[in-house]
């Protein structure tokens, strides 16, 4: 396993609809054709997998149908979107990139993006 640099933004604020997007960029050390991207969430020293996708270079990023993540790839950067977020989902979201094929295998883990989610205030009843 060889190490690889990964960069991602330090902080992202989710929209009022609970959607957060960020870029994950990696320093590809060679001609990888198969790449796996995983988003991990770290909160209270617990790390859980949020979503993962494997893609072939030049093809679209495809997550499982029930995934809360969507994304697109362009060269050695991936644009990730996480949906359905609520205030309790606030935490550090880490981008993990693996170059699966051809060998050698490379692994890169970003420093994480702190995603802040604020639940919207319910609309007050209207008198009109």
């Amino acid at each position: 396993c060889k190490a690889m640099h990964v960069a991602q933004p330090a902080v992202v604020l989710a929209s009022s609809r609970g959607i957060a997007s960020f870029v994950c960029e990696y320093a590809s050390p060679g001609k990888a054709t198969e790449v796996r991207v995983t988003v991990l969430r770290q909160a209270d020293s617990q790390v859980t997998e949020v979503c993962a996708a494997t893609y072939m270079m030049g093809n679209e990023l495809t997550f499982l149908d029930d995934s809360i993540c969507t994304g697109t790839s362009s060269g050695n950067q991936v644009n990730l979107t996480i949906q359905g977020l609520r205030a309790m989902d606030t935490g550090l979201y880490i981008c993990k990139v693996e170059l699966m094929y051809p060998p050698p295998y490379y692994l890169g883990i970003g420093n994480g993006t702190q995603i802040y989610v604020i639940d919207p205030e319910p609309c007050p009843d209207s008198d009109f």
Epitope: T33, G58, G75, N76, Q77
Partner: nanobody, 126 residues
């Protein structure tokens, strides 16, 4: 859209040095990571070096590490490849390529670059 033009190639004796330039027009190069590659007749394109947008991140394959150095001058919209201790096997056409990125990293994979120069010939011979 950015366009790239390489220069600085030519004939050099074994053990000599050359500095290649990759000049950009049509856009500011500081928005792009840049890579240098080469292709010899009958061989696959080979990665040589890359440099991130700010110049703080560079990467080289083991085959040229220590002999080749990549640098950039964003004020001149130019990226350079300094090549020392040249050998006959360094004879090839040298290309630079650019990729628009968000952060400071770069890639050594030719698959990641979407804009390429026309190339400059380097011949190492006595």
């Amino acid at each position: 859209e950015v366009q790239l033009v390489e220069s600085g190639g030519g004939l050099v004796q074994p053990g000599g040095s050359l500095r290649l330039s990759c000049a950009a027009s049509g856009d500011t190069l500081e928005s792009f990571a840049v890579g240098w590659f080469r292709q010899a007749p009958g061989k696959e394109r080979e990665e040589l070096a890359c440099i991130g947008r700010t110049g703080e991140f560079t990467d080289y394959p083991g085959s040229v590490k220590g002999r080749f150095t990549i640098s950039r001058d964003n004020s001149k919209n130019t990226v350079y490849l300094q090549m020392n201790s040249l050998r006959a096997e360094d004879t090839a056409v040298y290309y630079c390529a650019a990729e628009r990125l968000v952060f400071h990293l770069c890639s050594l994979s030719e698959y990641d670059y979407d804009t390429w120069g026309q190339g400059t010939q380097v011949t190492v011979s006595s």
